[in-house]
Every structure is written in C-alpha cells, then in structure tokens.
C-alpha cells in the first residue's frame, strides 16, 4: 500500500557533500506522526534501515548517524514513513537525496573567464579544469542547495575543462568546483580553491533570501 501517506522529508546535516571519514546525520521528518521511518539506500547493495520515529511539537523525526563516511555509503537515499508495525503500509518516498563523498581526488582549478570582479549585468562564465581526466564537473555556490554539473570537454592543452555560463551578473557569491568520474557519480574530488565573484556597479551585494528557490542541478541560472 505504498503512498497511503504523503511523503516525509529527508535532510543531511551538515550537508550532503561529506568528506571522507567525516560524520553526516541523515534526518527523516514529517508532520504526519509516523511510528517508524524506513531509510533506503540505492546502490550495489540495496539497504533499508528501520528507524523509530520520535514525536515532538507536532513533528515526527528520526536520525541516522554515519560516524565515518566511506565510499561504500555514498549513494541515493530515500525515506519512507510507516504508521503501523506492518512494513508494507508505508508512505510515498521522500525526494531522493544524493549523499556524495568528497575529497578523494586532486582538486580542480576554478577561474572566471573575465576575472573575479564583474560589472552588473555582464555575462559570467566560470571554468573548471584539471589535468585529471574527470568526466564531469560540479559547480557549487555557497548558500545554495544544488550544484550545477557539466561534462568535461575534450582534453585541451593537457587539461579537461567545463565552462559554466551563469548568465548576467547581479550579485556576487563564492563558488567551488569538484570533478568526478562517470563510473562513480557519488565520489568527487577535493574542492577547488573557493572563487569569490564580486559584482560592481550594483546597489547591493547581498545573499539570496532564504525563501528564494534554488535552481536544480544542471538548469541554467542567473548569478544571484
């Protein structure tokens, strides 16, 4: 009877990008008073863990702590809620959460094609490159939940590169990029050195408000 109840939420604290051997806590929660949560991990081994729900202030939740992150635990996780002792009466699944292990390979370089200081409205492109033969690059922006990703272009001057067009500049931000290989999408390189992009000729240089929807990975977006 999957989907009897609406889906719970699944969060990662402090975040879904986890350094090797560091701790991450996965939290299932819902405003439905679930007695149990089932945490499911997709991967070579499909694993399901049954967690007891705790009820506080009209919310049910359960935490799963990974004390030392390894490559074997990276993957796509989903959470289900259960209101009875029957494991078959579960809610719809939470949105998938990709837990990625970072810091495994050498860091790529990140640069802004027109330099890190740009005029408001100017089109910004960030380039991520490495001598390592990464198949994919991931660009993250501080304060945003999702990364953009692009395949690495063919080897040029001994490097593999991806160019991220961010559109017209409005607000600055701090960016990082990571490299990964096709066969291990949940295993990323060390972070590039952070790149602070500043926008001049703009009355404000604030962060996006918390209510602003963050773009999904891979969609074109403006530089906020």
């Amino acid at each position: 009877h999957e989907g009897v109840h609406r889906k719970p939420s699944l969060l990662a604290h402090p975040g879904r990008l986890v350094k090797s051997e560091e701790t991450v806590i996965l939290q299932c929660w819902s405003d439905v008073m679930f007695e149990h949560f089932l945490l499911h991990r997709e991967g070579m081994f499909n694993d399901t863990l049954r967690l007891i729900g705790e009820h506080h202030d009209g919310v049910s939740k359960a935490n799963f702590s990974i004390s030392r992150m390894t490559q074997d635990l990276a993957g796509t996780y989903r959470c289900y809620g259960s209101v009875t002792h029957s494991p078959y009466q579960v809610s719809a699944p939470s949105d998938p959460l990709d837990i990625v292990i970072i810091g495994l390979y050498e860091k790529p370089s990140l640069s802004a094609q027109l330099g890190p200081t740009v005029l408001a409205g100017e089109n910004v492109t960030l380039s991520c490159s490495s001598r390592s033969s990464y198949d994919m690059y991931h660009l993250s922006r501080e304060g945003e939940a999702h990364e953009r990703r692009l395949p690495a272009g063919p080897k040029v001057n001994g490097t593999f590169q991806a160019d991220f067009p961010l559109g017209p500049a409005t607000h600055g931000g701090t960016y990082r990029c990571f490299g990964s290989f096709h066969d291990s999408p949940y295993e990323w390189s060390k972070s590039s050195d952070p790149l602070l992009v500043s926008v001049t000729g703009n009355p404000s240089n604030s962060w996006p408000s918390p209510t602003e929807p963050s773009s999904k990975t891979g969609n074109p977006r403006h530089l906020h």
């Epitope: 070579m44 863990l49 030392r68 390894t70 295993e187």
Partner: antibody, heavy 117, light 111 residues
Framework: QVQLVQSGAEVKKPGSSVKVSCKAS????????ISWVRQAPGQGLEWMGG????????NYAQKFQGRVTITADESTSTAYMELSSLRSEDTAVYYC??????????WGQGTLVTVSS | QSVLTQPPSASGTPGQRVTISCSGS????????VNWYQQFPGTAPKLLIY???QRPSGVPDRFSGSKSGTSASLAISGLQSEDEADYYC???????????FGGGTKLTVLA
Amino acid sequence: QVQLVQSGAEVKKPGSSVKVSCKASGGTFSSYAISWVRQAPGQGLEWMGGIIPIFGTANYAQKFQGRVTITADESTSTAYMELSSLRSEDTAVYYCARGVRPPFPTWGQGTLVTVSS
Amino acid sequence: QSVLTQPPSASGTPGQRVTISCSGSSSNIGSNTVNWYQQFPGTAPKLLIYSNNQRPSGVPDRFSGSKSGTSASLAISGLQSEDEADYYCAAWDDSLNGWVFGGGTKLTVLA
C-alpha cells in the same frame, strides 16, 4: 592498516551447517561492506553475498539465496557467514573481503571448509 | 561455468608484454567497471586494477587495464618471473544483482 582475520578450518557432514567468522581490526568496521567469496579447489572465485554492518541488511547471490545467512556484529567488529544444507560441492576456501568501492582491496586469509561423510 | 570468460592460460618470457582478455555482457562489463585480481597459490586474491584502469597504491605501473564495450583486458609489460600467478576479472552484474568473476587465467612466465 585494516586486517581481516578469519576463523579456522572446519570439517562438516553433508546436510549440516557451518558458520565462519571474520574479525576486522585497524579501521572503521561499520561503514564498509563485507563480502563473502568462495573458491572450490582448483576453481575460480564466486561471490556469495555481502553486508554493510551499519545497515545490517544482507544481499545475497541468487545461487545461494535461502541457504546462506550473512550477519555482522558491530560491537565486536565481526562478520559471519553461515551456510546450511552442506553438500560435497561446498568444499572450498571461504574468504571475507572488505569494501565495494573499490571492490575488495582487503581480504581475510581464508577458511577451508571440507564437507565429507 | 563463469559469467565472465577468460582464457584458461597465458604465457610469456621475461621482459615481454602479455595481455589477458575478459569477455562479458551488457549487464556486467557493458554497464559497470572491471576489476582485476592476482592470486598466488595458497593465498588470498589481491586487488590489482579497479575501475577499469586504476591501480591501488603499491601496484607497479607495469600492470594496466582497459575496457571496450563488453570486453576488458589486463596488460602486463616487462613481464617478470614473480608475475606468475592466477588472474581474475570481476564486475558487478545488474541482472544478477551481484559480483561476477571470470574463470581465471593461469599466467606462466617461461624461462
């Protein structure tokens, strides 16, 4: 340096069960998969199944489904493989191996199980 | 009968380059990466190559791996007498939902 130490050789009668242990030392036990791989005399390698201790859910090769049980005890950093309804073809060296990404960089020394009447 | 197919034997003289093939299908080698193991008599296998062509630390660069379609190969250049061993390929199989191995190749280094 992670080490996997397995229990000693066993001689079993057909129809009985055997339980082999694999104790890990020198690293995080819970966060790495432990697989069991067997090798019959003069034969190749055969994956039987595996478990990630922190989850506790075992995954089995179709061939062994219903006959093998893989468990893990986080408190003692030990994984177990129990094979039931033994027959002479189950005579083999049984290895535990750690990790799936990359696969099996660390192996136990192997446990010889002989099934004979 | 192994899911992955390897030649039962291979040989070469010291200094030579030898290759060992491993043939599979779309559900294993075709969609997943290939790993190679080296095994000496009476000892546990040792990971030699993972993710098609990656060497764990401590494995000499004389060993290299490659993959194309549903086949893979292990190449050993500058063959040495201590390379005489059994070699196994392995890959995850999406249909069987488990690891599958080749039958193994016995490498002989001729004097």
